[in-house]
């Protein structure tokens, strides 16, 4: 999906209002310095591309982020403010349904969410630089 035509201001507002709080709740008890951020993004479409991939694509080390509250809200936000996004997400929805129901938060998932926080912060910063 090409995120170029999203309403970035609206996505920022949704992130600051709800998604950020859910990400921080998921990370509760973990210091932001516990993990080294190894990926970043350079502009708004790039940031959303990487956020989408890291949130919804299961990885060998962390297969279960897609069913978390912040992921559901991220999906809703992208569907709301990115034209045509929801039509591209049928396969992703199936992947979410197949995701393990276990609520165990592994260290690797914490690390992945730490990376997500970094990508979202970069998204906000790139937004500020464009204004």
């Amino acid at each position: 999906y090409d995120f170029t035509n999203c309403d970035f201001q609206k996505i920022e507002a949704d992130y600051l209002r709800t998604i950020s709080k859910d990400l921080i709740t998921y990370m509760s008890g973990t210091k932001s310095t516990d993990f080294n951020n190894t990926v970043s993004c350079s502009n708004r479409p790039h940031c959303l591309t990487e956020i989408q991939s890291l949130t919804f694509n299961p990885t060998p080390r962390c297969a279960s982020l897609a069913k978390e509250m912040f992921a559901r809200k991220t999906k809703a936000t992208l569907a709301l403010w990115c034209p045509g996004y929801s039509e591209t997400q049928i396969n992703a929805t199936q992947a979410m349904k197949k995701a393990r129901k276990s609520k165990v938060t592994t260290n690797k998932c914490l690390e992945q969410v730490s990376q997500l926080l970094g990508l979202w912060r970069r998204f906000i910063r790139t937004l500020l630089k464009k204004q």
Epitope: N36, N37, T38, V39, S40, C41, S42, N43, P45, H46, T49, E50, S53, L54, N57, T59, P60, R61, Q112, Q115, K129
Partner: antibody
Framework: QVQLQESGPGLVKPSETLSLTCAVS?????????WSWIRQPPGKGLEWIGY???????SYNPSLKSRVTISRDTSKNQFSLKLSSVTAADTAVYYC??????????WGQGTLVTVSS | EIVMTQSPATLSLSPGERATLSCRAS??????LAWYQQKPGQAPRLLIY???NLQSGIPARFSGSGSGTDFTLTISSLEPEDFAVYYC??????????FGQGTKVEIK
């Protein structure tokens, strides 16, 4: 200390597919970063080809996108480049590199690929 | 596409002299710029990222400055091992990361 090592045929015929592999040691490619390919034609500048992130997302240079595939094998801790329908213009030193998806922090030593019949 | 233009193409200096290399972007890229050094037969090495941040392990004689469209790499006092080709790279315009054509710093 991460180390990267490119390998693959040094000679490819026109219209065939160029295939290269980058073996990574000292860091797991599924633990972090992105894993990129960059090339440099003889005596010329650098051109970014694309990357695959540690979580599997890929991004390609739009000018090469229709011909490029980057994949990975986490069990062998390596990633690969396939470039189809090559011509003499694809003759270059090909580098693999570790990236944070912005700039390129660690590089392999490079491998020269010549496209010729 | 953002085009990166480096000048001069060649810089002839003596060890101990100050080197000033320029990189210009065809449109604004904020501070999304990196500098690399490449010696003959070797891979490039990252020197500077985000226009002015020194990569770990790089000597302090290297410094970067600039924002928007105009950027500078400065080597305060050239050492013999600094004679090489230097490239700038912009990463503002994903997925079109682009490099400058290079500046060769040679011994006068």
């Amino acid at each position: 200390q991460v180390q990267l090592q490119e390998s693959g045929p040094g000679l490819v015929k026109p219209s065939e597919t160029l295939s290269l592999t980058c073996a990574v040691s000292g860091y797991s490619i599924s633990s972090g970063y992105g894993w990129s390919w960059i090339r440099q034609p003889p005596g010329k500048g650098l051109e970014w080809i694309g990357y695959i992130s540690y979580y599997g997302s890929t991004s390609y240079n739009p000018s090469l996108k229709s011909r490029v595939t980057i994949s990975r094998d986490t069990s062998k801790n390596q990633f690969s480049l396939k470039l189809s329908s090559v011509t003499a213009a694809d003759t270059a030193v090909y580098y693999c590199a570790r990236t944070n998806l912005l700039y390129f922090e660690s590089w392999g030593q490079g491998t020269l690929v010549t496209v010729s019949s | 596409e953002i085009v990166m233009t480096q000048s001069p193409a060649t810089l002839s200096l003596s060890p101990g002299e100050r080197a000033t290399l320029s990189c210009r972007a065809s449109q604004g890229i904020s501070s999304y710029l990196a500098w690399y050094q490449q010696k003959p037969g070797q891979a490039p090495r990252l020197l500077i990222y985000d226009a002015s941040n020194l990569q770990s392990g790089i000597p302090a004689r290297f410094s970067g400055s600039g924002s928007g469209t105009d950027f500078t790499l400065t080597i305060s006092s050239l050492e013999p091992e600094d004679f090489a080709v230097y490239y700038c790279q912009q990463y503002s315009n994903w997925p079109q990361y682009s490099f400058g054509q290079g500046t060769k710093v040679e011994i006068k």
